[in-house]
């Protein structure tokens, strides 16, 4: 069934019904050079063939030039993310030219019509870039197109149509409907710029996916798996507004891509790292925290150029707000025996203790099942920098947290009524930090006591022999 979309109807209806009553207007695209960090400043409008505004408004031919391209609009006004992004670019790149591509009249239409207008707008941008290329010292290599939602595909068209190759395109949650699975010349793709990096924050495998699911760049980054963004759940939205709606959730998750990019501009000292992985499930298992062979990268503005032969899907976890950076850890727990496990999977929590801080109690997400006589890998992440890890507390939760687990426990009891206590043996935990690439091994405090059972905890300290595998470092990322 269709996803509801607030009090005004369903999501599908929103895609086909702009709020404005339309009148016949000539299609128009404007280029506004943002000459001030003050969002209220009117800036300077540039037009092909007119050199005077370039001089009057101090367009810097040798500097970087950013083109910000908005997406489909229901209101016909620039949304608030725009001036946040403009301001962040001005802060980070003081000499740069920041140009807003205003295609509101063509975007404030039925979604399907707006999609059909993306090609025209891409052409307009390409014409502007071709004209600028005629000027001395202007280089396409210094051009960075930043497109949000439908604007990402506009950027793709612009990169495709321009004479030459633009330096970079960043796609901020490129639009999904009518682009998913489309031919590479009808959507953003790696051949549209020298470097195409993409952030996917609202992808859905069910219902309507506002953002495109497929990889469309040289690197495609899927924060939090590219779907459910922290701080954007209905509960979070309900907490911040009197009557939260699905609309707010959609906006929050879709726009999260913009905020992650803004964060990368203004919180340069707190870079977020993403790690290459074949899929979200493997990442959740903690398998993919390597920086070898360009397998990790900064996200957003600080991303290092990678031109892979095929798309590189990368994943990371984030906080719910700026700064978004978290610290990722891979935990390898070797379970060498267990007793009377029954059907039910244990619920484990870890607390990490470091030289800088201690973590909260973190759940170990069991993606499939706990394997015995095998190494089980988990991903945990902390919001604070713990420093060097000193010890780990592993807790096996006692009482069942769900009716399903309770039922399984009850069934286990019926089949084995005199079931002795469930128990599991763990000697050591191997930990790898995603951010520093350091690996450490932690042993049980008491080598004689390696068993853990429901409601109990086990403490691990750095092994006495200081067992440490050689550090992996990445050539593409300056690790903090």
């Amino acid at each position: 069934s269709p996803v509801p979309f607030g009090p005004e109807g369903r999501l599908e209806d929103k895609l086909h019904k702009p709020k404005a009553t339309q009148t016949e207007v000539k299609p128009s695209v404007r280029f506004n050079l943002r000459t001030s960090k003050d969002p209220e400043h009117e800036g300077c409008y540039l037009s092909v063939g007119h050199s005077q505004p370039l001089e009057d408004c101090s367009f810097n031919m040798t500097a970087k030039t950013f083109f910000i391209i908005h997406g489909w609009t229901m209101s016909g006004i620039f949304e608030n993310w725009l001036h946040k992004l403009v301001s962040a670019l001005h802060t980070r790149e003081k000499d740069a030219n920041v140009v807003v591509v205003d295609w509101l009249p063509l975007a404030h239409q039925l979604y399907t019509d707006a999609v059909n207008n993306t090609r025209v707008v891409g052409h307009s941008i390409a014409r502007m870039l071709d004209w600028l290329q005629e000027k001395d010292d202007f280089s396409l290599g210094n051009v960075h197109l930043i497109g949000y939602s439908l604007g990402a595909h506009v950027a793709g068209y612009a990169g495709n149509f321009v004479k030459g190759t633009v330096g970079r395109i960043t796609g901020l949650d490129p639009a999904g409907p009518m682009f998913e699975g489309a031919d590479i010349h009808k959507r953003l793709s790696p051949d549209d710029a020298d470097f195409v990096d993409v952030l996917h924050t609202y992808t859905r495998s069910f219902g309507l996916s506002i953002g495109i699911q497929m990889p469309v760049g040289h690197i495609d980054i899927y924060p939090n798996g590219g779907d459910f963004q922290p701080g954007c759940g209905l509960n979070d939205v309900l907490g911040s507004i009197a009557y939260g709606t699905i609309t707010e959730v959609v906006k929050c998750e879709h726009e999260r891509a913009v905020h992650l990019f803004v964060d990368s501009l203004v919180n340069q000292d707190k870079p977020s790292f993403a790690f290459q992985c074949t899929d979200s499930n493997r990442f959740k298992k903690g398998i993919c925290l390597s920086c070898r062979k360009n397998r990790c990268n900064s996200i957003g503005y600080n991303a290092k150029k990678m031109r892979n032969k095929r798309n590189s899907k990368m994943y990371l976890k984030t906080r719910a707000g700026m700064p978004f950076r978290v610290y990722h850890y891979q935990m390898k727990i070797h379970v060498f025996s267990y007793k009377n496990m029954g059907e039910i999977e244990p619920t484990f929590y870890v607390t990490l203790y470091g030289t800088n801080a201690d973590s909260q109690t973190l759940p170990l997400e069991i993606v499939e099942r706990i394997e015995q006589n095998a190494t089980n890998t988990f991903l945990v992440y902390t919001e604070e920098d713990l420093g060097d890890l000193l010890k780990i507390q592993l807790t096996w939760e006692g009482a069942s947290q769900s009716w399903y687990n309770l039922w399984k426990e009850f069934r286990s009891y019926l089949s084995q009524p005199r079931n002795p206590g469930r128990e599991l043996n763990i000697r050591r935990i191997r930990v790898k930090s995603g951010e520093t690439q350091r690996k450490l091994t932690f042993c049980t405090e008491d080598p004689e006591n390696t068993s853990i059972s429901p409601g109990r905890e086990l403490w691990f300290r750095k092994c006495r022999d200081g067992w440490r595998m050689k550090n992996e470092t990445s050539p593409t990322v300056e690790l903090p």
């Epitope: 709020k19 404007r30 209220e40 009117e42 608030n80 507004i241």
Partner: antibody, heavy 120, light 112 residues
């Protein structure tokens, strides 16, 4: 200096049409959006909608869809509000007010207001 | 639509004292650290004049005795010290990026 100058007071009968003008000066007309706001006698302010002064695309608040029309004469830096099939409840002062496309959408300059009286 | 509720509907303040006007929104008007709440002053027979934008920023040419504060759903306009010429009706106005934009019901300030 920046000014929005509106046309004078109007006295109309129910069923008639009125067209109120708002002439802008002191800035580039097409670089700012234009709002229309209604204030009935002794009542609060009610946002009617806005028009994109570059593209001419109007957006109407729900209560002002149908009989109300925003238009432009860009060459004269003038925005218009037309109300068709006037009703007694249209009696009010109508203000035009500009806002920045790129900013936080507050209304920084207002016209002096046009008083419309609808009476048989 | 976001509903703005102003209180009190009217108040009388002595010259030189503080006037405090409250505006409560039916849902948050915040976005990424900014509050899209504005305040206007309207005197009889005149158009409204911008006093405060984005919750706490002073409009052009507005004296420093006017100040705004608040975030989320609760906002306040303070005038201190109140002067004779401040007798007017004050309106709050939300300008989030999802119109319709709405105004509060107004607060009439009288100087004693």
């Amino acid at each position: 200096q920046i000014q929005l100058v509106q046309s004078g007071p109007e006295l109309k009968k129910p069923g008639e049409t009125v067209k109120i003008s708002c002439k802008a000066s002191g800035y580039t007309f097409t670089n700012y959006g234009m709002n229309w706001v209604k204030q009935a006698p002794g009542k609060d302010l009610k946002w009617m909608g806005w028009i994109n002064t570059y593209s001419g695309v109007p957006t109407y608040a729900d209560d002002f869809k149908g009989r109300f029309a925003f238009s432009l004469e860009t060459s004269a830096s003038t925005a218009y509000l037309q109300i068709n099939n006037l009703k007694n409840e249209d009696t009010a002062t109508y203000f035009c007010a500009r806002f920045s496309y790129y900013g936080r959408h507050y209304f920084d300059y207002w016209g002096q207001g046009t008083t419309l009286t609808v009476s048989s | 639509d976001i509903v703005l509720t102003q209180s009190p509907a009217s108040l009388a303040v002595s010259l030189g004292q503080r006037a405090t006007i409250s505006c409560k929104a039916s849902q948050s008007v915040d976005y990424d650290g900014d509050s899209y709440m504005n305040w206007y002053q309207q005197k009889p027979g005149q158009p409204p004049q911008l006093l405060i934008y984005a919750a706490s920023n002073l409009g052009s040419g507005i004296p420093a005795r006017f100040s705004g504060s608040g975030s989320g759903t609760d906002f306040t306009l303070n005038i201190h010290p109140v002067e004779e010429e401040d007798a007017a009706t004050y309106y709050c106005h939300q300008s989030t990026d999802d119109p319709p934009w709405t105004f509060g019901g107004g607060t009439k300030l009288e100087i004693k």
